[in-house]
């Protein structure tokens, strides 16, 4: 674009520039090219010799230009159109410049430190001095002439006339600049051009509110010497929470988000949540709803699956396994991750549920007790006599952490019915002798319940390293027995296991190994009150 | 607001000369880049154009009529005038008065017209 | 002389139709100085001729923006969007890039 220094037509008031002498150029009204009034200066002492008539405009402030455009629009009289004239007559006029740092004021051109530049010598357009049928003289002759580079603050034209007839119709002064813009989110600053001779003026852009470049490397464009943009370079990107809207970002709206600036547009809210604000950059779930940490913004949110579905058990008793199957959860939660926990408790026999204990570090879950993503497990190292409750529940990646003992599980309670119900470290050694040994156990049936008095106890003993094919048998129906004729400084190994009425003996195994050393002959005998 | 009026002698005989005034309001002949001229349109034709006269008293005339027309003004009556010598019936039409626009030669206001008639 | 023809003699058209009229010219029009110098006029029946356009696209001051002209070199074209009752009578185009002027020989718009 040109930014204007000075329009002559821009003016209806009187122009008021400097004429030396006062008989040369003269102000008058007129028309333009579109009949508008305007104010001109004329000058057309073509019959009298050796005239040197100045006019010089008022100061222009060359505001950031350097290299300032100057155009004139005129009419040039042929000298052969005007009878007696010949001799003296001219077809031309000069135009020049000065440089000041402030307005000379009404005084001579010629005054005021420095000489006037001549910027070049001004003839009509060839056509105009052929026509002799007076159509020259309506067709505005149009000049443009470059000064410059200029240094100092502003300058006055001047135009010297030395015999022409001419009208001097408008006079405009400017310079070229790249207009203010904005481009790839980027504004860029009005900027003067260079000449037509130099390089591109490189202007770095600004983003444009709520937008961002890429880190050090601004979005630069060129200004060229036409006053055109060119080359741009590079471009900014809407904000996180904003999308682009043609030259300017907007804030995403309620419903919308976007997560991050390289994407352009603003996203829906994904399923099960919301943004209720402008310029969201995430979208908040819906209450019993969320996102696991490794879920992107884009995800939908989900929410914790229902229980397992149809949970069914088999309980083989020799050895002693729980087996266990179920179906996957009708409400997945809108996840694929689900993966299934166990959790194991041992209850009394009798009683309200709560009087449970998880079952310790014994019981053995295969293929192990959390994170399955099968639907079925096996619990091992289970006691005989004993009622376990198993839980599985169903967890996906936004399960709490304590969701496995919350609400979304299933549940089944076993009874392992008699047997032998002991860990190793529950049987004691009351009493070792060179020939003897003693041990108690505690009852697998309370005292006092149905069934505890009808339990019987078998007791399988050899001697550690012979076959175990060549055991002895003892029996006993209290929860104690006392082992003779054995071989002193000899290792035993024990096994014990009880049957009530119901099931044969057969149908019960062994608990584990114990291992008891008779003592020495010399040695005298101990009562040992603490369990192996 | 501009206005042009044509006066003429409404019927002359051939060989004679014609003489029209314009009288105009509105501007001022003096300013730089007025001009005024003379247009005809025999009844039922086109328009011919004929001669302009300029602010600084610069004529133009149309070549085929050149030798019979003479423009000139009084810049302080604000009137235009135009003679045409050796009139012929050929001559008979209506003839407008019009301010020519600002350097491009069009005409931008034109008189109401003067009838002239040419005949024995 | 430069010889200018409008076609058509005739344009019968509707009211809030759009009309065309074609400006040929035998020479080009455009000036040494750039500009091209063709108008156009119209008049309406007993009365003096009126500017529309000046220098081929250039609306004369309180004409309706209905009317606008287009063209270059030889060829030009004024063009009405919807005609009105007033819009009736003879238009002519006129070019004065060359001594003499001339005008066309007029487009008569009339009601079909």
């Known amino acids: 674009e040109e930014v204007i220094l000075l329009d002559s037509k821009a003016s209806q008031a009187e122009l008021g520039w400097t004429a030396l002498p006062s008989n040369g150029w003269e102000e008058i009204s007129g028309v333009d090219e579109h009949d508008r009034p305007i104010r001109t200066y004329q000058v057309c002492n073509v019959l009298e010799p050796n005239q040197d008539n100045w006019l010089q405009t008022g100061w222009i402030s060359r505001g950031r230009g350097q290299r300032i455009f100057v155009e004139l629009q005129f009419t040039l009289r042929d000298c052969s159109s005007i009878p007696g004239a010949a001799g003296t007559c001219k077809e031309t006029f000069n135009v020049y410049y000065l440089e000041t740092e402030a307005d000379l004021g009404r005084g001579r051109p010629r005054l005021g430190g420095s000489r006037p530049r001549k910027i070049d010598t001004i003839a009509a357009d060839e056509s105009f001095t052929q026509g002799d049928l007076g159509e020259r003289k309506m067709k505005l002759n149009t000049e443009v002439r470059e000064i410059g580079p200029l240094s100092r603050r502003g300058f006055h034209l001047a135009f010297q006339d030395v015999g022409a007839c001419v009208a001097l119709v408008s006079v405009r002064v400017y310079y070229k600049q790249c207009r203010a813009t904005v481009r790839g989110l980027a504004t860029f600053p009005a900027t003067a051009a260079e000449s037509a001779f130099s390089t591109l003026v490189e202007v770095a852009g600004t983003c444009v509110a709520h937008s961002e470049g890429e880190p050090g490397s601004p979005p630069r464009m060129h200004c060229g010497a036409d006053g055109e943009w060119l080359v741009p370079v590079g471009r900014c990107s809407c904000s996180a929470g904003f999308q682009e809207r043609g030259d300017f970002c907007e804030a995403c709206p309620p419903g919308f988000y976007k997560v991050s600036p390289r994407r352009p547009l603003c996203s829906p809210c994904p399923e099960h949540s919301r943004a209720l604000e402008n310029a969201s950059t995430f979208c908040v779930c819906q209450d019993s709803y969320a996102r696991s940490p490794t879920d992107p913004p884009s995800a939908s949110c989900t929410r914790p699956p229902s229980a397992p579905r149809d949970l069914q058990y088999s309980l083989s008793r020799s050895p002693l396994v729980l087996r266990l199957r179920w179906l996957p959860p009708a409400d997945s939660g809108g996840r694929s991750d689900v993966t299934y926990s166990l959790l194991c408790l041992r209850c009394g026999r009798e009683g309200p549920a709560g009087a449970c204990e998880p079952c310790g570090p014994r019981v053995a879950f295969l293929p192990r007790q959390a994170g399955l993503r099968e639907r079925a497990a096996t619990l091992l190292h289970l006691r005989p006599g004993a009622r376990y409750t198993v839980r599985v529940a169903a967890l996906n990646g936004v399960s709490g952490p304590a969701a496995a003992a919350g609400t979304t599980y299933a549940q089944v309670t076993v009874s392992t019915g008699p047997g032998a119900p002991w860990e190793e470290d529950e049987i004691r050694r009351d009493r070792v002798e060179p020939q003897s040994v003693s041990l108690s156990w505690r009852e697998p049936i309370p005292a006092g319940a149905p069934g505890a008095n009808d339990t019987e106890y078998e007791i399988r003993y050899y001697e550690k390293g012979q076959s175990e094919q060549t055991y002895s048998m003892v029996k006993t129906g209290a929860p104690t027995v006392t082992v003779t004729n054995l071989k002193p400084a000899t290792r035993y190994v024990f096994q014990i296991r009880a049957a009530s009425p119901g099931p044969s003996w057969e149908a019960q195994s062994f608990n584990p190994s114990i291992e008891v050393q008779t003592l020495g002959e010399a040695a005298s005998g101990s009562r040992d009150q603490s369990p192996a | 607001q501009v206005t042009l009026k044509e006066s003429g002698p409404g019927i002359l005989q051939p060989s004679q000369t014609l003489s029209l005034t314009c009288s105009f309001s509105?501007?001022?002949?003096?300013?730089?880049?007025?001009?005024v001229g003379w247009i005809r349109q025999p009844s039922g034709k086109s328009l011919e154009w004929l001669a302009n006269?300029?602010?600084?008293?610069?004529?133009s005339y149309n070549p085929a009529l050149k030798s019979r027309l003479t423009i000139s003004k009084d810049n302080s009556r604000n009137q235009v005038f135009l003679k045409i010598a050796n009139v012929d019936t050929a001559d008979t039409a209506t003839y407008y008065c019009?301010?020519?626009?600002?350097?491009?030669?069009?005409?931008?206001?034109w008189g109401q017209g003067t009838l002239v008639t040419v005949s024995t | 002389d430069v010889v200018v023809t409008q076609t058509p003699l005739s344009l019968p058209v509707s009211l809030g139709d759009q009309a065309s009229i074609s400006c040929r010219s035998s020479?080009?029009?455009?000036?040494?100085?750039?500009?091209?110098?063709l108008h156009w006029y119209l008049q309406k029946p007993g009365q003096s001729p009126k500017l529309l356009i000046y220098k081929v696209s250039n609306r004369f001051s309180g004409v309706p923006d209905r009317f606008s002209g287009s063209g270059s070199g030889t060829d030009f074209t004024l063009k009405i969007s919807r005609v009105e009752a007033e819009d009736l009578g003879v238009y002519f185009c006129?070019?004065?890039?060359?001594?003499?002027?001339?005008f066309g020989g007029g487009t008569k718009l009339e009601i079909k």
């Open positions: 509105g501007f001022s002949l003096s300013s730089s880049g007025m001009g």
């Open positions: 019009v301010r020519v626009g600002g350097y491009g030669d069009y005409f931008a206001y």
């Open positions: 020479q080009s029009l455009v000036h040494s100085n750039g500009n091209t110098y």
């Open positions: 006129s070019q004065s890039t060359h001594v003499p002027y001339t």
């Open positions: 006269i300029w602010w600084d008293d610069d004529k």
